[in-house]
């Protein structure tokens, strides 16, 4: 609450997050134009990469593009994308939502589409839908450990969300426990009124914000955390805006001397931790 | 403007960007002691990062040192390191610019000059200037979409500088266009009255200040983004305090059984996006 | 100090790191059985990550768990893991601790021991202590440079830490060369008041706070930074809640064509730069 | 059904050489260990060397140096070079592989045996 009479300070923050869970994924893998069943575990190596303090990635869901290499190939037929003949490829063109620079050239794509040949990472990804449901729609009981460490230098005080008196296996709950800083994702989600199985297909950014209203003086002292959630990126987001929340990252390697990649689109939650609030003193 | 009645609060922000465009590259390769012309085509897995939100980095140049092994080499002969005798090499010594251990012996580098030998990532990475013009230079049209959520905790207040009215194919303009959201790298630096073209040789840094004045009252309700640009690094810094932006990173790999590296230094435009502002109530 | 007349204004920042230096890192290697004395040569490419301006991570300390592959295999014995039968291992179970799914099945992980069989990246990670001494002990030596913008925009005033009287090859010091911008990791950790090597081992977070009390009225103009340091993570954890800082991370490879990695524990410090302050104008 | 079919074995003389091979057959997921073993006349099975998906390996102490355990994951397939044979390597060799069927349902399979005779 405000008290006038006091010299307020914003906070200076710190944050270090851990992640821990393991996810099976089933999904069909397709090897020498065989398909077949592939099952594998993901843990925090293979979803999460190393990040800064206030932010934290988990994957929930990919496509792969395996096998690329730099040569021509026809661009993927989406809409507005297909040719009849060369006329409609313009030598050395970059379309924005293309992968590659066209060579002037239609050429055919499969037995009934042509499209424009390009110079590109070939065969070019294929523009399909995020798999349904998520491929580590488990990661919602995965766990995330918020650790918060803040300081308001005017008034030279630092403490943290952590006490010693915490116990180590406790679990968030806004009721019972709020003061606990081990997170399961699918409750960060509950708590923002959002589901974590459909947010998982398309990703999203998941806000925790972490406020501190601290009262510093001997006589009344108070400084703990309060923690709530919010959804930051806009579920409602027209198709051109990119919906969602995903990236693309790739796996370079050498076959037969020839440089070729994976290519993957990552698609996961961004957990942005927010950290605000002000320390007063008389 | 400033409304002295009004309880002002700092901004909350979140942003998400998205960089889309390819660039093609012609460069000299040289394999097997041939120089030929290598033509290659990069795409946002590429030349992008997968990093936070506030910064978002795009490569611009680079220089490559390919097949380097743990072993002993003659250090590179920039100023000042070039020897005659095993005397002017300490054994064990780590010169803080080069970029291995010496041994204590001086050893021919070439036909011409003698270094230190040191042990080291071998060869060692030639100190060459960044290639002019940039390899990239083609990045001055690729567009990035920067969506921002904001956050007033005091006030209840969320919006967001994407509204549902908007259409995904602007171009953001100061005049024409000022709401748009989408910003074409090489607009953002001549806003800034830097030369892209230049600055993506070296690198540097480059601010994106999203400036949110919001009047929450009813009766004279308004918030929505002012965008304005500003370049970040120092263009007439010392040379010893390392001008523009550059990193080295590197693609480890296996080849008859010896761990060897391919070590990049990119260069590159790092986009910092600042977000500040205040809202005012009653 | 507070002029009350002034009209404050926070610091909007922009921060910018390079680390130098190389480490001799000496350790055990295992090939093919055989045990031999390993001797490698780290620099900036190995030991650090292309991170954001406000953090930058020096690695200081690895454990590295090459080779895994997805099959099955026992899990680690650590405490409380341990099985006498197929009973005391349920199919499907994750448990947290633990990297991967169980099979329902208890199978000997050595002579003497026998775990329960899971589907995971094998050999499952040993849950081994960081070497002590830590690898890269000789980071203490490194050097890093911070180049700092900052900007009042209200006041429409931007200035940086790095002069152009400053000179590239000085080195902080609280007494004799407090402007300088060039720091000694182990310096940073010495003001701190904390021992580098101690917590080089476990990994830590150190706090380099930069704090602007700015002046800018022209009669008594005065803008300078003042650099601070502590640390941020907290020394006397309790082990549940992870001490020290580290993540996993992955390099992939196919060999036999079976998709392997080579996972690291990457202990280290990462280092958060804190600006703060107000600019004040009449 | 999941079959191992193994070959390769037969007599020879003291210091030569064999290559056994087993290959697994049929519908399945996924081979994990895969392993020799042998039963020589009035003695009980022993393991000679096994190998992981990811290739690694493990001995017997007695074929230490002298016999190699390989693997094709792309055949399923199991090798084991033995040179330097002695007589005391006389026994029927077995192959063995711990077979996903479907996802987390392993199975122990093994071959039928092959003979393998080193005269002196």
């Known amino acids: 609450s405000d008290k006038l009479y006091q010299r307020k300070e914003p906070v200076i923050s710190s944050v270090h997050t851990k992640v821990k869970g393991i996810a099976e994924v089933t999904e069909n893998v397709t090897e020498g134009g065989v398909t077949k069943l592939g099952h594998s575990i993901f843990d925090t190596a293979d979803y999460t990469f190393p990040l800064q303090g206030n932010s934290f990635f988990v994957m929930t869901n990919y496509v792969k593009s395996e096998g690329q290499v730099q040569t021509l190939c026809p661009e993927y037929p989406r809409r507005g994308a297909q040719c009849s003949s060369d006329r409609r490829c313009k030598k050395g063109w970059m379309d924005p939502q293309s992968k590659g620079i066209q060579t002037g050239r239609c050429v055919p794509y499969d037995k009934t589409r042509k499209t424009c040949e390009v110079s590109a990472w070939c065969p070019t990804e294929e523009e399909k839908e995020a798999p349904r449901p998520a491929l580590l729609r488990s990661a919602e009981n995965f766990t995330v450990l918020i650790k918060n460490n803040i300081h308001f230098p005017g008034h030279n005080y630092t403490t943290r969300n952590i006490l010693p008196t915490m116990n180590g296996s406790c679990t968030f709950h806004k009721t019972w426990d709020p003061q606990c800083s081990i997170f399961r994702l699918g409750d960060i989600f509950q708590e923002a009124g959002e589901n974590f199985t459909e947010v998982a297909v398309q990703g999203g950014i998941m806000g925790i914000e972490i406020y501190w209203d601290c009262n510093l003086d001997s006589w009344s002292h108070h400084c703990r955390p309060r923690y709530s959630f919010r959804r930051l990126d806009d579920k409602n987001m027209d198709e051109s805006f990119v919906p969602g929340y995903n990236f693309r990252y790739a796996k370079y390697y050498k076959e037969n001397n020839v440089e070729k990649r994976t290519l993957i689109k990552a698609f996961g939650i961004r957990f942005d931790i927010l950290v605000f609030g002000t320390g007063g003193k008389f | 403007s400033d409304k002295l009645y009004q309880r002002k609060e700092p901004v909350i922000s979140s942003v998400h960007t998205k960089v889309k465009g390819i660039a093609e590259v012609t460069e000299n390769v040289t394999e097997g002691g041939v120089t030929k012309l290598g033509h290659s085509i990069f795409d946002t897995a590429d030349y992008t990062f997968p990093l936070q939100g506030n910064s978002f980095f795009v490569m611009t140049n680079y220089v490559k040192s390919e097949g380097q092994v743990q072993t002993l080499c003659p250090e590179y002969p920039r100023r000042g390191a070039q020897c005659s005798s095993d005397r002017r090499c300490k054994k064990g010594w780590m010169d803080p610019q080069s970029k291995g251990i010496q041994t204590g012996r001086c050893v021919p580098y070439d036909k011409t000059r003698k270094t230190c030998e040191v042990s080291a990532w071998c060869p060692t990475e030639e100190e060459k200037e960044a290639p002019r013009p940039a390899l990239l230079r083609s990045a001055e049209n690729f567009t990035v979409l920067i969506k921002n959520n904001i956050h007033f905790p005091g006030h209840n207040y969320t919006t967001r500088n994407i509204l549902p009215t908007m259409n995904g194919s602007c171009t953001f303009h100061k005049t024409w266009d000022p709401q748009c959201s989408i910003f074409r790298l090489g607009d953002i630096f001549q806003e800034a009255g830097e030369n892209f073209t230049e600055v993506a040789v070296q690198g540097g840094i480059m601010g994106i200040e999203i400036y949110w004045d919001c009047n929450l009252d009813s009766w004279s309700h308004h918030c929505r983004p002012r965008y304005s640009f500003r370049r970040l690094d120092d263009k007439n810094m010392d040379e010893s305090f390392v001008p523009g932006y550059n990193f080295r990173y590197a693609k480890y790999y296996k080849e008859n059984n010896v761990e060897k590296r391919t070590l990049i230094k990119a260069f590159g435009i790092r986009f910092d996006i600042l977000v500040f502002g205040t809202g005012g109530k009653f | 100090s507070d002029k009350l007349y002034q009209r404050k204004e926070p610091v909007i920042s922009s921060v910018h790191t390079k680390v130098k230096g190389i480490a001799e890192v000496t350790e055990n290697v295992t090939e093919g059985g055989v045990t031999k004395l390993g001797h490698s040569i780290f620099d900036t490419a190995d030991y650090t990550f292309p991170l954001q301006g406000n953090s930058f991570f020096v690695m200081t300390n690895y454990v590295k768990s090459e080779g895994q592959v997805q099959t099955l295999c026992p899990e680690y014995p650590r405490r409380g893991a341990q099985c006498s039968s197929d009973r005391r291992c349920k199919k499907g179970w994750m448990d947290p601790q633990s990297k991967g799914i169980q099979t329902g099945r208890c199978v000997p992980y050595d002579k003497t021991r026998k775990t329960c069989e899971v589907s995971a990246w094998c050999p499952t990670e040993e849950e081994k202590e960081a070497p002590r001494p830590a690898l890269l002990r000789s980071a203490e030596n490194f050097t890093v440079l911070i180049k700092n913008n900052i900007h009042f925009p209200g006041h429409n005033y931007t200035t940086r830490n790095i002069l152009p009287t400053m000179n590239g090859s000085c080195t902080f010091h609280k007494t004799w060369d407090p402007q300088c911008s060039i720091f000694r990791l182990g310096d940073i950790f010495q003001e701190a008041g904390e021992n580098f090597t101690e917590v080089a081992v476990q990994g830590g977070i150190m706090g380099i706070e930069i704090y602007w009390d700015c002046n800018l009225d022209s009669w008594s103009h005065h803008c300078r930074p003042r650099y601070s340091f502590r640390r941020l993570d907290d020394k006397n954890m309790d082990e549940s809640f992870v001490p020290g800082y580290n993540f996993r991370y992955a390099k992939y490879y196919k060999e036999n064509n079976v998709e392997k990695r080579t996972l690291i524990k990457a202990f280290g410090i990462r280092f958060d730069i804190l600006v703060f302050g107000t600019g004040g104008k009449f | 059904e999941v079959q191992l079919v193994e070959s390769g074995g037969g007599l020879v003389q003291a210091g030569g050489s064999l290559r056994l091979s087993c290959a697994a057959s049929?519908?399945?997921?996924?081979?994990?260990?895969m392993a020799w073993y042998r039963q020589a006349p009035g003695k009980q099975r022993e393991l000679v060397a096994d190998i992981t998906r990811g290739d690694r390996t493990n001995y017997a102490d007695s074929v230490n140096g002298r016999f190699t355990i390989s693997r094709d994951n792309v055949r399923n397939t199991v090798y084991l070079q033995m040179d330097g044979l002695k007589p005391e390597d006389t026994a029927v060799y077995y192959c063995?592989?711990?077979?996903?069927?479907?996802?987390?349902?392993?199975?122990?399979?093994w071959g039928q045996g092959t003979q393998v005779t080193v005269s002196s």
């Open positions: 049929g519908s399945f997921f996924r081979v994990n260990n």
């Open positions: 063995y592989a711990r077979i996903e069927l479907g996802v987390l349902v392993p199975r122990d399979y």
